[in-house]
C-alpha cells in the first residue's frame, strides 16, 4: 500500500492533508518496510546475516553513512547541512538499489518498490531543501562502471554485497528519519 493510502487514513476522513514532514516520514517508513521484506529473503537464502562485522567491514563498498560532521547528529545539528547530506546520500544509494533489482526471486516487486519509493523520497526532500546547489549528483559513468563491477563478482560476494547494501541503507534511512523529526 503506498504511503498515505493506508486504512488509518481511510477511516479518518476528517484528518488534515499530510504536511510535507509527515509525507516524508511516511515515505521513509514505507521504504523501511520494503527493506525488511528484502532482508528476510536475503537472510533465509544465505548465512550472510550471521556474518561477523569484521568480515563485512572488509568489503570495499563505499556506502553512504552518517557522521557527526554531516550535521544530522544532535551535537552540531544543522538542518540545511543535514538535509544536503540526506539527499546526497540517497542519490549515492541509487546505483546500489539498481544493483539489487536482479537479486531477488520472490521479492522482485518489493525491490522495485524500494527503488521507486526512494526516487519519490528524494523529490520530497529536494522540495524541502533550500540549498540545492550544494547537492552533488553522482557521475553516471562512474555509476555504470561500478554497477558492472558489482555484477561481475562471484556468487558469495554478490550475496555479501546485497546484504551489506540492505543493512547500510536501513541504517542510513533510520539516521535520516531521526534527524528529520528534529527539524
Amino acid at each position: 500500500v503506498p504511503p498515505g493510502e493506508d486504512s488509518k487514513d481511510v477511516a479518518a476522513p476528517h484528518r488534515q492533508p499530510l504536511t510535507s514532514s509527515e509525507r516524508i516520514d511516511k515515505q521513509i517508513r514505507y521504504i523501511l518496510d520494503g527493506i525488511s521484506a528484502l532482508r528476510k529473503e536475503t537472510c533465509n537464502k544465505s548465512n550472510m546475516c550471521e556474518s561477523s562485522k569484521e568480515a563485512l567491514a572488509e568489503n570495499n563498498l563505499n556506502l553512504p553513512k552518517m557522521a557527526e560532521k554531516d550535521g544530522c547528529f544532535q551535537s552540531g545539528f544543522n538542518e540545511e547541512t543535514c538535509l544536503v547530506k540526506i539527499i546526497t546520500g540517497l542519490l549515492e544509494f541509487e546505483v546500489y538499489l539498481e544493483y539489487l533489482q536482479n537479486r531477488f526471486e520472490s521479492s522482485e516487486e518489493q525491490a522495485r518498490a524500494v527503488q521507486m519509493s526512494t526516487k519519490v523520497l528524494i523529490q520530497f526532500l529536494q522540495k524541502k531543501a533550500k540549498n540545492l546547489d550544494a547537492i552533488t549528483t553522482p557521475d553516471p559513468t562512474t555509476n555504470a562502471s561500478l554497477l558492472t563491477k558489482l555484477q561481475a563478482q562471484n556468487q558469495w560476494l554478490q550475496d555479501m554485497t546485497t546484504h551489506l547494501i540492505l543493512r547500510s541503507f536501513k541504517e542510513f534511512l533510520q539516521s535520516s528519519l531521526r534527524a528529520l523529526r528534529q527539524m
Epitope: 516520514d25 517508513r29 541504517e171 533510520q174 539516521s175 528519519l177 531521526r178 523529526r181
Partner: antibody
Framework: QVTLKESGPTLVKPTQTLTLTCSFS??????????VGWVRQPPGKALEWLAF???????YYSPSLESRLTITKDTSKNQVVLTMTNMDPVDTATYYC??????????????WGQGTLVT | DIQMTQSPSSLSAFVGDGVTMTCWAS??????LNWYHQRPGEAPELLVF???NLQIGVPSRFRGSGSETYFTLTINSLQPEDSGTYFC?????????FGGGTKLEI
C-alpha cells in the same frame, strides 16, 4: 532474552556527582535502530526522561538538565553510563535505564531495568 | 518541547468494567505515541507503541487509538492486575516527554 540492570550509589551528598551504570544483555548497542535511555521517577511522581544514546553514538539530553548530564556507551562491555553533576535533594528518585529498539524509531522503551533508588 | 497531558488523573472501576483514558499532545506527533503501565514498586511496562500497536504479550483487551494530538487507551473487561498508573509518552522527537499519569484503582 533482553535484560537491563542499573547499578550505582544509593546515597549521594549534595553537590556530588552521581554515576550510574546500565549493564544489559540480549541485544547489541551496535545494531541500527537500537538505543538506551535513562528515565527517573521521584517518589509518588511521574516519569521524567533524562538522556538517550543511539547505536551510532548520537546523544540526546533533557534540555532542563543538559548542563549536568553526560551519557556514554561501551559497546564491547554492553554498558551505558550516565553521570549527573551537582546533585541536589530534589534529584532523589528511582533511576531506570531502558531499551528502545524498532525499525521505525518510535522511541518506545520496550524493556526496562528494575530501577535504582538514589537519595 | 511537546507537552503531554493525561486525563483523568485518577479513576476507579470494578473487575469486568471497561475504562478509557486520554492523552493530549501540545502539537501534532502523528502516531508517535506510546503507553506504559506501572504497578507500585515496579518498573513501567510498554503496552502500546505507535498509538495503536499492542506490544507482544499484552492482552487484546487493551486498545490504543488516536493520531496527531489526541490519543486514547481503552481497557475492556478489567482484571485486578490492571490496577496501577498508566503513562503516555511522546515518541515523535527529542526531548521525550511523559504525561502526568492516570492512576487506575480496581
Amino acid at each position: 532474552q533482553v535484560t537491563l540492570k542499573e547499578s550505582g550509589p544509593t546515597l549521594v551528598k549534595p553537590t556530588q556527582t552521581l554515576t550510574l551504570t546500565c549493564s544489559f544483555s540480549g541485544f547489541s548497542l551496535s545494531t541500527s535502530g537500537v538505543g538506551v535511555g535513562w528515565v527517573r521517577q521521584p517518589p509518588g511522581k511521574a516519569l521524567e526522561w533524562l538522556a538517550f544514546i543511539w547505536w551510532d553514538d548520537d546523544k540526546y539530553y533533557s534540555p532542563s538538565l543538559e548542563s549536568r548530564l553526560t551519557i556514554t556507551k561501551d559497546t564491547s562491555k554492553n554498558q551505558v553510563v550516565l553521570t549527573m553533576t551537582n546533585m541536589d535533594p530534589v534529584d532523589t528518585a528511582t533511576y531506570y535505564c531502558a531499551r528502545s529498539a524498532d525499525d521505525y524509531l518510535y522511541y518506545s522503551f520496550d524493556t526496562w531495568g528494575q530501577g535504582t533508588l538514589v537519595t | 518541547d511537546i507537552q503531554m497531558t493525561q486525563s483523568p488523573s485518577s479513576l476507579s472501576a470494578f473487575v469486568g468494567d471497561g475504562v478509557t483514558m486520554t492523552c493530549w499532545a501540545s502539537q501534532s506527533i502523528n502516531d508517535y505515541l506510546n503507553w506504559y503501565h506501572q504497578r507500585p514498586g515496579e518498573a513501567p511496562e510498554l503496552l502500546v507503541f505507535a498509538a495503536s500497536n499492542l506490544q507482544i504479550g499484552v492482552p487484546s483487551r487493551f486498545r490504543g487509538s488516536g493520531s496527531e494530538t489526541y490519543f486514547t487507551l481503552t481497557i475492556n473487561s478489567l482484571q485486578p492486575e490492571d490496577s496501577g498508573t498508566y503513562f503516555c509518552q511522546s515518541g515523535h522527537s527529542f526531548p521525550l516527554t511523559f504525561g502526568g499519569g492516570t492512576k487506575l484503582e480496581i
